[in-house]
């Protein structure tokens, strides 16, 4: 749903959707679709997986990821961490904003059992112009993408 | 950090709650209470389970459903799908907006074990006047209603 | 219930974070950090675990709690209840607003298995000036605090 960033008129908002390219396997944040289908940017920008704030203020930020698997992959940690993190030009490390830990694999009582789980995060944070918010999932091998409706990332100014 | 909104404008919002009549067993969407208790409509209308948009714009839409059971009913799919879907007068199919899949039954290690789970969805979507949003749960037999606080559906313009 | 937002007025919002002092073991609501780190209050106040409304209107209220354990403590109910409740000067009892029930312990198949789960709640409710909203978790022994990113409580006017 494209992009609208009119100064002084619209309330900044965005909804980014999961795509085949979301999972990089590089240890970096998840990447997102910004234009096609349900995705849009309005008063926010995007760069390398990050929502970039163009107007300082308080934002409700949110993310959902769809998890799933057949049993548990060898070497998979029993904990899945899904979080929203802030990157700021004035600080070298990412800052945790909102984080969840889940043990979805424990639900599958046999190694061949199919299981699904979903993790949702949302909360209000203050963001300065130029600051970036990213989504990370550890272990991202369990994120199940499909059509942009099951894993997504968004924000709006409150 | 000031935010401006023009005086006398009401921001569309709604919160609908689960009721005994929510589960129809007909394959249709869940039905909701619109007036009693915590439920309300403000600048949105309601028809046959659907929130109906009267003013085009970007809306944060959300739903939570309370799931529960004793073991797993025979014939129950191992996956529960909870989703928000869009209906429009000029388009023949429902469009998926936000969807979650969960396998809550897998938690119960014996057939007589009581289990509970909850599914929350929320995200920003663009809606045109006249478009409708509904909630579906497959299999709805696992939705546990009580007093409108555990399963609900809402939206507000952002 | 019409709500106006005069131009140049700050929109009430808050985000409170979990801290070591959050779990009192007294049967009362969870307590929260209001100023340090990511926590803030803007147009809302705080008292003994409660967000206190200073301006009547519709608010999106939300809470997330991080649950976790090693197996299940003896005497632990199989159901964990996480809820947002309203206290009002004109009514002696707390009113349930948004509630979730989960059975996270059921995921751990052995008594020594580490497990994690997260519960998120969010929805729009009407609140009058002077009314209070609190978070309760039963059994709060399973709430896992760390740095304010995993368990939190917030609201903003819509």
């Amino acid at each position: 749903l494209i992009q609208e960033r009119r100064s002084h008129e619209v309330n900044p908002a965005a909804h980014l959707t999961g795509a085949n390219s979301s999972l990089t396997g590089s240890g970096g944040p998840l990447l997102w679709e910004t234009q096609l289908g349900l995705a849009f940017l309005r008063g926010l920008s995007y760069h390398d997986g990050a929502l970039v704030v163009t107007k300082a203020g308080y934002y409700y930020i949110y993310s959902k990821v769809q998890l799933g698997g057949v049993g548990c992959p060898l070497g998979l940690a029993s904990t899945i961490t899904h979080g929203l993190y802030k990157r700021t030009p004035r600080y070298p490390e990412e800052l945790e904003l909102l984080v969840s830990q889940q043990s979805p694999c424990g639900r599958a009582t046999s190694s061949s059992r199919v299981w699904w789980d979903s993790s949702f995060l949302g909360g209000v944070v203050h963001l300065e112009a130029g600051e970036k918010v990213v989504v990370r999932v550890l272990d991202e091998r369990l994120v199940r993408l499909r059509d942009g409706t099951r894993s997504y990332f968004g924000a709006f100014m409150v | 950090l000031i935010q401006e909104r023009r005086s006398h404008e009401v921001n569309p919002a709604a919160h609908l709650t689960g009721a005994n009549s929510s589960l129809t067993g007909s394959g249709g969407p869940l039905l909701w209470e619109t007036q009693l208790g915590l439920a309300f409509l403000r600048g949105l209308s309601y028809h046959d389970g659907a929130l109906v948009v009267t003013k085009a714009g970007y809306y944060y839409i959300y739903s939570k459903v309370q799931l529960g059971g004793v073991g797993c009913p025979l014939g129950l799919a191992s996956t529960i799908t909870h989703g928000l879907y869009k209906r429009t007068p000029r388009y023949p199919e429902e469009l998926e907006l936000l969807v979650s899949q969960q396998s809550p039954c897998g938690r119960a290690t014996s057939s007589s074990r009581v289990w509970w789970d909850s599914s929350f969805l929320g995200g920003v979507v663009h809606l045109e006047a006249g478009e409708k949003v509904v909630v579906r749960v497959l299999d709805e037999r696992l939705v546990r209603l009580r007093d409108g606080t555990r399963s609900y559906f809402g939206a507000f313009m952002v | 219930l019409i709500q106006e937002r005069r131009s140049h007025e700050v929109n009430p919002a808050a985000h409170l974070t979990g801290a070591n002092s959050s779990l009192t073991g007294s049967g009362g609501p969870l307590l929260w950090e209001t100023q340090l780190g990511l926590a803030f209050l803007r147009g809302l106040s705080y008292h003994d675990g409660a967000l206190v409304v200073t301006k009547a209107g519709y608010y999106y209220i939300y809470s997330k709690v991080q649950l976790g354990g090693v197996g299940c403590p003896l005497g632990l109910a199989s159901t964990i209840t996480h809820g947002l409740y309203k206290r009002t000067p004109r009514y002696p009892e707390e009113l349930e607003l948004l509630v979730s029930q989960q059975s996270p312990c059921g995921r751990a198949t052995s008594s020594s298995r580490v497990w994690w789960d997260s519960s998120f709640l969010g929805g729009v409710v009407h609140l009058e000036a002077g009314e209070k909203v609190v978070v309760r978790v039963l059994d709060e022994r399973l709430v896992r605090l760390r740095d304010g990113t995993r368990s939190y409580f917030g609201a903003f006017m819509v």
Epitope: I2, Q3, E4, S7, L36, F40, T54 | - | -
Partner: antibody
């Protein structure tokens, strides 16, 4: 009024390069992506790529990734498309276009005719 | 890439006629289809977005329908100013693609 004003026609030799400009007015330039589309004579439209004027981020159609390069000059609210190693197949009208809220391409430049000929 | 096939290539009509232009996608694109009109030596003009949604300033005689892979642009009671090329465009997958166009001409 929202306008996208493109540079005039260009005649270039095979193997040469050309730079087409698109000057935006009537809105905040950094608030909307600029897309580039080409139309060969009597043919359909082909999407080349887009640029985010706010941060210079780009996305290209794989078909054009080696020949097209998109840039912006925020100070003049102008987007540029640099086309290199041109062949006669690249003779076409090149359009810049802009999205708007929930609409694809309600705003278009008037087009720039690029002719590649020896 | 998603291929959009428009038919017919040319449609000859008389003003006052009602016509339907077809656009077929090589795979499902949900409702992510848009229609443009282009007159000779002019830039394209957006007519319909997301299969059926109307655009401000576009006459109500233009309407869209369809889903999945089959889409239709209908012009109720064609007027002389409607003659020109009509293109469909998908925004479901990168790269964005356009149909080859249908030429609406005077019979």
């Amino acid at each position: 009024e929202i306008q996208l004003q493109q540079s005039g026609p260009d005649l270039v030799k095979p193997g040469a390069s050309v730079k087409v400009s698109c000057k935006a007015s009537g809105y905040s330039f950094t608030d909307y992506y600029i897309y580039w589309v080409r139309q060969s004579h009597g043919k359909s439209l082909e999407w080349i790529g887009y640029i985010d004027p706010y941060n210079g981020g780009t996305k290209y159609n794989q078909k054009f990734k080696d020949t097209a390069s998109l840039t912006v000059d925020k100070s003049s609210s102008t987007a540029f498309m640099h086309l290199n190693s041109l062949t006669s197949e690249d003779s076409a009208v090149y359009y810049c276009a802009r999205t708007s809220g929930s609409s694809w391409f309600p705003y278009w430049g008037q087009g720039t005719l690029v002719t590649v000929s020896a | 890439d998603i291929v959009l096939t428009q038919s017919p290539a040319t449609l000859s009509v008389t003003p006052g006629d009602s016509v339907s232009l077809s656009c077929r996608a090589s795979q499902s694109i949900s409702n992510n289809l848009h229609w443009y009109q282009q007159k000779s030596h002019e830039s394209p003009r957006l007519l319909i977005k997301y299969t059926y949604q109307s655009i401000s300033g576009i006459p109500s005689r233009f309407s869209g329908s369809g889903s999945g892979t089959d889409f239709t642009l209908t012009i109720n009671s064609v007027e002389t100013e409607d003659f020109g090329m009509y293109f469909c465009q998908q925004s479901n997958r990168w790269p964005l693609t356009f149909g080859a166009g249908t030429k609406l001409e005077l019979k």
